[in-house]
């Protein structure tokens, strides 16, 4: 059961209920486990995991990435700015997670779990965020055309895109987890 769902809490009534921060932490770790499982399939299926970073860098995907200005690094840490960046970044990743849905054979359920757990994580974080006005939601039309474009790529590019999305999402979540533990 994904940590975003409550059946674990019901099954263990004597355990202290998780705090908001603990829930978020657990949710991120659950998603990272899912990403790792998906990457096992992609690495077994293609040689993308051996691709050099140079080859990856040539891919023109505009995936969310933490930068100094986002306030998530300890030097220049800013809780509100960082939280906005994490939520905005996760919202931007949603279209890429949608793209992943038809990319797996044996791990189809795992891909769905990563997508749904990310939606739950966004909800947790939105409850935590005070300045929701600063969070920009991606334009659905732009997302739809991006999805169409990604799905029209040749097989090699689709494999590369899948690998790059999973790697970038992992790094974004790791950065987010480090930052959230400072909050």
């Amino acid at each position: 059961v994904p940590p975003g769902e409550d059946s674990k809490d019901v099954a263990a009534p004597h355990r202290q209920p998780l705090t908001s921060s603990e829930r978020i932490d657990k949710q991120i770790r659950y998603i990272l486990d899912g990403i790792s499982a998906l990457r096992k399939e992609t690495c077994n299926k293609s040689n993308m995991c051996e691709s050099s970073k140079e080859a990856l860098a040539e891919n023109n995907l505009n995936l969310p990435k933490m930068a100094e200005k986002d306030g998530c690094f300890q030097s220049g840490f800013n809780e509100e700015t960082c939280l906005v960046k994490i939520i905005t970044g996760l919202l931007e990743f949603e279209v890429y997670l949608e793209y992943l849905q038809n990319r797996f054979e044996s791990s189809e359920e795992q891909a769905r779990a990563v997508q749904m757990s990310t939606k739950v994580l966004i909800q947790f974080l939105q409850k935590k965020a005070k300045n929701l006005d600063a969070i920009t939601t991606p334009d659905p039309t732009t997302n739809a055309s991006l999805l169409t474009k990604l799905q029209a790529q040749n097989q090699w590019l689709q494999d590369m895109t899948t690998h790059l999305i999973l790697r970038s999402f992992k790094e974004f979540l790791q950065s987010s987890l480090r930052a959230l533990r400072q909050m």
């Epitope: 770790r29 690094f73 300890q74 790697r167 790094e171 950065s175």
Partner: antibody, heavy 127, light 111 residues
Framework: EVQLQESGPGLVKPSQTLSLTCTVS??????????WSWIRQPPGKGLEWMGV???????YYKPSLKSRTSISRDTSKNQFSLQLSSVTPEDTAVYYC???????????????????WGKGTLVTVSS | QSALTQPPSMSGTLGKTLTISCNGT?????????VSWYQQLPGTTPKLLIE???TRASGIPDRFSASKSDNTASLTISGLQSEDEATYYC??????????FGGGTHLTVLS
């Protein structure tokens, strides 16, 4: 008990590529959330972290060495390798491989704690 | 030039307590609980003493303890013994995705 063993040539000529392999026994490099690092120590000097390959096969390198360094793994042989190109005499050092990734390191990407080390192998760069 | 700064050498008296400091920045030591300490006896491989700022590695005696304040980490050895004579290194995760070591502190134990 996890054991690591470095192997490779002890002498490399300047401008060539240094290649080392670390063979891991007592545990698979593919079945846990650990990462695998390379660290070097020039004679009489301190330790220098060079890079790491994590559980997913992602690599991270010391910024100043990034352009010359490559770490890869072969899970079927339970080995990981280091390649350092365009070497100079300043690259002469004892090269260690080590296991990293205690606690929550995988989830955080913070491979700062290395609990098992190889014995080290001295590589001399000289013509 | 090491990324983390340690005193190159220190001496302590048998049975006494000694503290080694390790100075960094907000990008490394200050960035979280990501500090480790190593002991390297002469001619041997480094050995993990401490991880996660304060947690002793398996089999490490409680004479070794560590702490952190802001951008400085410290290793304290109490009840100094002759076998503690070694070089001690601190290490830290550094944003983004790399690791840095201190230059090492050579400890001499005086009787």
């Amino acid at each position: 008990e996890v054991q690591l063993q470095e192997s490779g040539p002890g002498l490399v000529k300047p401008s060539q590529t240094l290649s080392l392999t670390c063979t891991v026994s007592g545990g698979s490099i593919a079945t846990s959330y650990y990462a695998w690092s390379w660290i070097r120590q020039p004679p009489g000097k301190g330790l220098e972290w060079m890079g790491v390959i994590d559980y997913d096969g992602d690599t991270y390198y010391k910024p100043s060495l990034k352009s010359r360094t490559s770490i890869s793994r072969d899970t079927s042989k339970n080995q990981f390798s280091l390649q350092l190109s365009s070497v100079t005499p300043e690259d002469t050092a004892v090269y260690y491989c080590a296991r990293a990734g205690l606690g929550d390191s995988y989830y955080l990407g913070t491979y700062y704690a290395m609990d098992y080390w190889g014995k080290g192998t001295l590589v001399t760069v000289s013509s | 030039q090491s990324a983390l700064t340690q005193p190159p050498s220190m001496s302590g008296t048998l049975g006494k307590t000694l503290t080694i400091s390790c100075n960094g920045t907000s990008s490394d030591i200050g960035s979280g609980d990501y500090v480790s300490w190593y002991q390297q006896l002469p001619g041997t491989t480094p050995k993990l003493l401490i991880e996660g700022v304060t947690t002793r590695a398996s089999g490490i005696p409680d004479r070794f303890s560590a702490s952190k304040s802001d951008n400085t980490a410290s290793l304290t050895i109490s009840g100094l013994q002759s076998e503690d004579e070694a070089t001690y290194y601190c290490a830290s995760y550094r944003e983004t995705n790399n690791v840095v070591f201190g230059g090492g502190t050579h400890l001499t134990v005086l009787s």
